[in-house]
Amino acid sequence: FERTRSLQDPCSNCPAGTFCDNNRNQICSPCPPNSFSSAGGQRTCDICRQCKGVFRTRKECSSTSNAECDCTPGFHCLGAGCSMCEQDCKQGQELTKKGCKDCCFGTFNDQKRGICRPWTNCSLDGKSVLVNGTKERDVVCGPSPADLSPGASSVTPPAPAREPGHSPQ
């Protein structure tokens, strides 16, 4: 079958990194500069992705594979294949249309990305606040007052960590 296909379509013999040049009797020609073909039998080469501005080059384009970008420091990748770059903020902040803004009282963000999330409400688990929350850190819940009374045999283990919030993508 492969031999038959080759006889019918000479382009199928063109390897990755080349294209089947209709202008030259379907000879396999190398991809021009700044282009690539990642599979054989291509009739054109694809233009290499350019990593510029907010993007920087993580992997150079070759004749057989596209360039890969990441983000210039101060920004982080979003989307498949780093299709976008989003601004970093400091811990204790979240990104808004107006840029990085401090977390409101009662919320925190311990990362350079994502949104400010409410402090854990210790009382919902019958616990007390052991360490106060800040813009950068969640509160630490301690044992309930009852657990600290004389004769209490053991300290209640801390509540399991909540699933952290994620930056919308």
Epitope: G79, S83, M84, S167, Q169
Partner: nanobody, 123 residues
Framework: QVQLVESGGGLVQPGGSLRLSCAAT?????NYWMNWVRQAPGKGLEW???????????YYVDSVEGRFTISRDNAKSSLYLQMSSLRAEDTAVYFC????????????????SGQGTTVTVSS
Amino acid sequence: QVQLVESGGGLVQPGGSLRLSCAATGFTLSNYWMNWVRQAPGKGLEWVANINQDGSEKYYVDSVEGRFTISRDNAKSSLYLQMSSLRAEDTAVYFCARGGEGYGVDHYGLDVSGQGTTVTVSS
């Protein structure tokens, strides 16, 4: 091909003014939020300003508020940054950048940017 090309940079004295332009081709400018970002020598990238599709919303980083003005002319597929009362710390390469699909709703990601134009503030 989607492309952004900045121009208008140059050498200016402290206190002076400069107007940067960004020409957009290969897409309809009026469909997108647009941004200016900058990179000072040896520093990371810093967001400067953004503007919504029709120019009714504009936001700035605190350090340029009241000195810089972002604007757009969708009919000319152009974005602008008017910079006045320039300071040495404004020295940077300035890039215009397009807000990706869903910008301001799902994320604040930038998906296309230009090569940049250099602004040097020095006496």
